[in-house]
């Protein structure tokens, strides 16, 4: 007889799950020598454990402790670049500029990264049919309490002047409901973090507006000043350029507006 | 509750070396679970880092400090340590201990957990 199983609004978990998340980690292991100390079978078993055999509505950062405990990972705390949007350019920033680190540059943002995972209640099973979406189902759901855990902890780490990588695209260019909006600007530390500096993304070749006036831009200059934390923008009215000019800055084309 | 509390001179004379220690309580400073570090607050000035300690031993310092700082932790005691030497009058500023959570992604500032601060005046 079929055991009935809970039908959820989001996609279920990715398929091979297990083994990408642990050959994630072994590559991710032998890339970076600082992390080559870590366990990479005791990396999944923290993962697993942090969902399997639990309600998928029902998960708490605590049930993430011990894979954050195992992730553990320095970045540089001024080297710090968040992103709301647009995480191809700001990953495709980061490869180019490697001193600077986005969440996905780290170890628990680099296993995550654009999966799906989660289980069923008293069960050891994957749920691979379905899993619970964020605004139709619940917010408790296994992705969602992972990235609000490690996009805390990955704001609670920046000091000096963060960067966040802005889609001047998108209707709401800053958005209180995004994981940078709801989670990352309140836990930028005031006592730590002198400057957030906003790079907007222009989409269009012949757009020259200044997208720093935006209204949601000033929304975001707003809550960032009552923290106590400086605030600037700029305008990147030709991405492509600039990435081109962060990999050779020497270009005479590199110093007029980007 | 990791509790910290540093103790030293208040009053240090130019050209010589600050020391400061700091007592750890509810935690162990040997324990991998923490990382350890100490702050600065110079009169009207913004906080900042002089540097922390890794569990294993690995240091950082702030770039502009390095050569005159040293961070050491003492097990026995459950105590870590600054020396800050060839002080000038622009090195008086309230010190503190910190102590950050390993658990995810860590800056090399630690701020879950910070001492009352101790005022180090340098003057003659």
């Known amino acids: 007889v079929p055991r009935w199983r809970q039908q959820w609004s989001g996609p279920g978990t990715t398929k091979r799950f297990p083994e990408t998340v642990l050959a994630r980690c072994v590559k991710y292991t032998e890339i970076h020598p600082e992390m080559r100390h870590v366990d990479c079978q005791s990396v999944w078993d923290a993962f697993k454990g942090a969902f399997i055999s639990k309600h998928p509505c029902n998960i708490t950062e605590e049930d993430y402790q011990p894979l954050m405990k195992l992730g553990t990972q320095t970045v540089p705390c001024n080297k710090i670049l968040l992103w709301s949007r647009i995480k191809d350019l700001a990953h495709q920033f980061t490869q180019v500029q490697r001193d600077m680190f986005t969440l996905e540059d780290t170890l628990l943002g680099y296993l995550a990264d654009d999966l799906t995972w989660c289980g069923e209640f008293n069960t050891s099973k994957i749920n691979y049919q379905s899993c619970p979406d964020w605004r139709k189902d619940c917010s408790n759901n296994p992705v969602s309490v992972f990235w609000k855990t490690v996009s805390r902890r990955f704001a609670e780490a920046a000091c000096d002047v963060v960067h966040v990588m802005l889609n001047g695209s998108r209707s709401k260019i800053f958005d209180k409901n995004s994981t940078f909006g709801s989670v990352e600007v309140h836990n930028l530390q005031p006592e730590k973090v002198q400057t957030l500096e906003a790079w907007v993304i222009h989409g269009g070749r012949e757009d020259s507006r200044d997208l720093c006036q935006d209204p949601t831009i000033k929304e975001l200059e707003s809550i960032i000043s009552k923290r106590n934390i400086q605030f600037s923008c700029k305008n990147i009215y030709r991405p492509d350029k600039f990435l081109q000019c962060v990999k050779n800055p020497e270009d005479s084309s590199c110093t007029s507006e980007i | 509750q990791l509790q910290l509390q540093e103790s030293g001179p208040g009053l240090v004379k130019p050209s010589e070396t600050l020391s400061l220690t700091c007592t750890v309580s509810g935690g162990s400073v040997s324990s991998s679970s923490y990382y350890w570090g100490w702050i600065r607050q110079p009169p009207g000035k913004r906080l900042e880092l002089i540097g922390s300690?890794?569990?294993?031993?690995?240091?950082y310092f702030n770039p502009s400090l390095k050569s005159r700082v040293t961070i050491s932790v003492d097990t026995s005691k459950n105590q870590f340590s600054l020396k800050l030497s060839s002080v000038t009058a622009a090195d008086t500023a309230v010190y503190y201990c910190?102590?950050?959570?390993?658990?995810?992604?860590?800056?090399?500032?630690?701020?879950?957990?910070r001492g009352q601060g101790t005022l180090v005046t340098v003057s003659s």
């Open positions: 300690i890794y569990y294993g031993g690995s240091t």
């Open positions: 910190a102590g950050g959570d390993t658990y995810g992604p860590v800056g090399q500032w630690p701020s879950d957990y």
